[in-house]
């Protein structure tokens, strides 16, 4: 028969013929022969292969360090990766995560839109006319000038958008 | 700083048992095992066995199976190793140590001297 | 299970020689680890996953196999080196350590 040139999904070809892939956590010990099957072994501890493969090594853990402030989110099988993340308060440089940096905290005049997460970054927006933030944070939002007139007073200094507006008694007309 | 702290030497009689502890700090105890060894005086390193203290999880060697328990406090970060039915060949410096990629060091605790005595 | 067979059991090398210290399993396992220890400390990892040296472990250390044989070796001795060596297995339960090697300085 003519040898194949191509081969089914989890197989691959080698010498003219077809072998069997390793399943996911384990690697290639040695191709498969017209007499023999693909010998495999399982990856050790703190080793892993995510996929149907013929890899001779299996890939180590990642390492999710705490002096760069990352922790472990999800603890590595031999088929999966560890998946690191970062401590409270700050959030990853990367995609792959490899390291942290302190959230972003938003200025005085500037309040958080979004909530940083181990991932994102906080987003700041300048307060709008009628909102003040007068404090330095990753958490607050700008916060809406105080209505004088619904507790009676009148407004006895302009807020900004760092400050909030000064409330002050009304002036009583003298008969 | 990555340690592993265990607790101190053991003066035991044959058929007592004895619990040893081992405390983590620098690292979440859950997230990686935590192995047991053990070392006869002027004899070489023994595996006794391992805990996932995320989940319990634990595997001895057969020659310990039933006479050694490990447990995990993910609370105290700390990992015990309890064996039972002591006997004068158990006298041994006993070490708690990690997954080996922890900081690329594999930390070792200081080793706890165990006695077995009448 | 597996058993792990270190070989020399004890060996002395003069300062600058070459040193190979070898560990045959019953089967093929994924990787070994090798260990360091010296009288009265706790053991330490020196080599993992067969060939990667473990932090502050001197370049002039190295390791290598596959399968069933592996092997660590040390381009010139050194007296700081005098300590015994242990290779471990953590591919299949129980894992387990060879008997150790005594590397003694001439």
């Known amino acids: 028969p003519e040898p194949p040139t191509a081969c089914r999904e989890k197989q691959y070809l080698i010498n003219s013929q077809c072998c069997s892939l390793c399943q996911p956590g384990q690697k290639l010990v040695s191709d498969c022969t017209e007499f023999t099957e693909t010998e495999c072994l399982p990856c050790g501890e703190s080793e892993f292969l995510d996929t149907w493969n013929r890899e001779t090594h299996c890939h180590q853990h990642k390492y999710c360090d705490p002096n760069l402030g990352l922790r472990v989110q999800q603890k590595g099988t031999s088929e999966t990766d560890t998946i690191c993340t970062c401590e409270e308060g700050w959030h990853c440089t990367s995609e792959a995560c490899e390291s942290c940096v302190l959230h972003r905290s938003c200025s005085p005049g500037f309040g958080v839109k979004q909530i940083a997460t181990g991932v994102s970054d906080t987003i700041c927006e300048p307060c709008p006319v009628g909102f003040f933030s007068n404090v330095s944070s990753a958490f607050e939002k700008c916060h809406p000038w105080t209505s004088c007139e619904t507790k009676d007073l009148v407004v006895q200094q302009a807020g900004t958008n760092k400050t909030d507006v000064v409330c002050g008694p009304q002036d009583r007309l003298r008969a | 700083e990555v340690q592993l702290v265990q607790s101190g030497a053991e003066v035991k009689k044959p058929g007592a048992t004895v619990k040893i502890s081992c405390t983590v700090s620098?690292?979440?105890?859950?997230?990686?095992?935590i192995h047991w060894v053990k070392q006869r005086p002027g004899k070489g390193l023994e595996w006794m066995g391992r805990?996932?203290?995320?989940?319990?999880?634990?595997k001895y060697d057969p020659k310990f199976q039933g006479r050694v328990t490990m447990t995990a406090d993910t609370s105290t970060d700390t990992a015990y190793m309890e064996l039972s039915s002591l006997r004068s060949e158990d006298t041994a410096v006993y070490y708690c140590?990690?997954?080996?990629?922890?900081?690329?060091?594999?930390?070792w605790g200081q080793g706890t001297t165990v006695t077995v005595s009448s | 299970q597996i058993v792990l067979t270190q070989s020399p059991t004890i060996m002395s090398a003069s300062p600058g020689e070459k040193v190979i210290i070898t560990c045959s399993a019953t089967?093929?396992?994924?990787?070994i680890l090798w260990f360091q220890q010296k009288p009265g400390t706790s053991p330490k990892l020196w080599i993992y996953?067969?060939?990667n040296l473990a932090s502050g472990v001197p370049a002039r250390f190295s390791g290598s196999g596959s399968g069933a044989s592996y092997s660590l070796t040390i381009s010139r001795m050194e007296a700081e080196d005098a300590a015994t060596y242990y290779c471990?297995?953590?591919?299949?339960?129980?894992?387990?350590f060879g008997g150790g090697t005594k590397l003694e300085i001439k």
């Open positions: 805990i996932d203290p995320e989940d319990g999880d634990t």
């Open positions: 996953s067969t060939s």
């Open positions: 089967s093929s396992v994924s990787y």
């Open positions: 471990q297995q953590r591919t299949f339960y129980p894992y387990t």
């Open positions: 140590t990690t997954s080996y990629y922890v900081g690329t060091y594999g930390y």
């Open positions: 620098g690292f979440n105890i859950k997230d990686y095992y």
